[in-house]
């Protein structure tokens, strides 16, 4: 039960995380005009990975796409790549994890196969989360560098010539969405990896070996946490361990409403 919950929760957390990564990648507010200690302009500038926007004080907003690939900074290209890799890995991870979910039955899929799939999706989520966090962090670092450079330029004018006031940019909402989303995807991936350990069957987990002593029978399960002792010959149907491993009779059960999505 705990394994199923961990796996399910990991899936949901990763799903939210990946949705957040996609949202952050599409958002226009990666960097927003710094309004603090800056000559106040009647327009508000903000930029995303794909386009830059200007909001007039009237509320009219105009966005322009970056219609060039070669003319863009290498760092921006790198951030785009990291975010896309994160989304692709996350999407594949989600697809794999759907089939790996313990509550979903697909034919006669072995638990060992589900465990492997859970581990695979978990690793994919971890890498996806790391890609997103890395992408957002690289962009944030770029912003910080540019912010202080433009601040320096603001105060070292052109020696009496026309002074240009540079628009400084600070962290936009997308950065925070990206960091949180990356973190959630990472956590979801870790949870999937933890769930995998509980799912992974040890060879003996499914075979209850009975040792018959005179007078009473003891069912001993080498891989389990409990040794069940009982009188009579009821050992075959006895539920030995409720942590996911089952006796042979229990393995085959009727489909319930939770078996299909």
């Amino acid at each position: 039960m705990a394994v199923t919950a961990c796996q399910g929760l990991g899936f949901v957390v990763s799903l939210i995380g990946i949705a957040g990564i996609i949202a952050a990648t599409c958002m226009d507010q990666w960097s927003t005009q710094d309004l603090y200690n800056n000559p106040v302009t009647a327009v508000f500038n903000y930029q995303g990975l794909w386009r830059s926007c200007v909001r007039e004080s009237s509320g009219f907003t105009e966005c322009r796409g970056y219609f060039t690939l070669l003319g863009l900074p290498a760092m921006l290209q790198a951030v785009r790549a990291l975010m896309i890799v994160g989304i692709v890995l996350g999407a594949i991870g989600l697809l794999v994890s759907i089939f790996a979910l313990k509550c979903i039955r697909i034919g006669s899929m072995e638990d060992s196969a589900k465990a492997n799939m859970t581990l695979t999706s978990g690793i994919m989520f971890i890498v996806s989360g790391l890609c997103a966090i890395a992408g957002v962090s690289v962009f944030a670092n770029m912003l910080v560098t540019n912010f202080w450079m433009s601040t320096a330029n603001m105060y070292t004018g052109m020696g009496g010539m026309v002074q240009t006031v540079q628009t400084r940019y600070t962290f936009g909402a997308a950065l925070f969405v990206g960091w949180v989303a990356g973190g959630l995807t990472l956590i979801g991936g870790v949870m999937m990896c933890i769930a995998c350990r509980g799912l992974a069957p040890e060879e003996t987990n499914y075979k209850a070996v009975s040792y018959h002593a005179s007078g009473h029978s003891v069912a001993y399960k080498p891989g389990g946490f409990k040794a069940s002792t009982g009188f009579g010959s009821n050992t075959k149907n006895k539920k030995i361990y409720d942590g996911g491993a089952r006796t042979e009779d229990e393995v085959q059960s009727y489909p319930s409403k939770h078996d299909y999505v």
């Epitope: 106040v40 302009t41 926007c53 200007v54």
Partner: antibody
């Protein structure tokens, strides 16, 4: 069509206050900024400030802070500018102007109110 | 505050002539975000309120005759009237509508011979 109606003249005594009105018609009053501009006789134009009727958010020229107060009455689609403790050099034509949608320019202007400060 | 310097302060021309007036700002009025210059030109005829002619330095307001052309970028801007008509007698103001407070130039008075 867009119209901004202002009273033609206001005569006030030095040190007194005056409230200049600007009644808007022909457009959605709450959707556009209302600007106020001062023009002394034979002189250039000076931006006083602006107010957004939807939420009364405003920006002032530092020079006119404390001198001018911008307000709106949404129920009557009217913008007001109160000028306090007027000296004779505040005698001027005061225009209200509707902000444009696409840019920050002033698309339509009222005819102006001549405020005369005289004893 | 941004200083808008207009020149000449006045000029007298004959109808049909081409006229050019300039406006220089103390800081760049080009917004990098949308590559637009936030300069507006107004025409004020005697006894009338100003009228919007050109915004974003070069975009003509609807209804404005195409003999009026705005150009320039950064700090230097120009208003050109390709063929002056008698009704163009007015004072022309340029305005910074990028930085607060919005500021106007001192105006160029156009007189017809």
């Amino acid at each position: 069509q867009v119209q901004l109606q202002q009273p033609g003249t206001e005569l006030v005594k030095p040190g007194a206050s005056v409230k200049v009105s600007c009644k808007a018609s022909g457009y959605t009053f709450t959707s556009y900024w209302m600007h106020w501009v001062k023009q002394r006789p034979g002189q250039g134009l000076e931006w006083i400030g602006r107010i957004r009727p939807s939420d009364s958010d405003s920006n002032y020229n530092q020079k006119f802070k404390g001198k001018a107060t911008l307000t709106v009455d949404k129920s009557s689609d009217t913008a007001y500018m109160q000028l306090n403790s007027l000296p004779s050099e505040d005698s001027a034509v005061y225009y209200c102007a509707m902000g444009a949608y696409f840019s920050n320019s002033f698309a339509y202007w009222g005819q102006g109110t001549l405020v005369t400060v005289s004893a | 505050d941004i200083v808008m310097t207009q020149s000449p302060s006045s000029l007298t021309v004959t109808a049909g002539e081409k006229v050019t007036m300039t406006c220089k700002s103390s800081q760049t009025l080009l917004n990098r975000g949308n590559q637009k210059n936030y300069v507006t030109w107004y025409q004020q005829k005697p006894g009338q309120p100003p009228k919007l002619l050109i915004y974003w330095a070069s975009t003509r307001e609807s209804g404005v005759p195409d003999r009026f052309t705005g150009s320039g970028s950064g700090t230097d801007f120009t208003l050109t009237i390709s063929s002056v008509q008698a009704e163009d007698l007015a004072v022309y103001y340029c305005q910074n509508d990028y930085f607060f407070p919005f500021t106007f130039g001192s105006g160029t008075k156009l007189e017809i011979r």
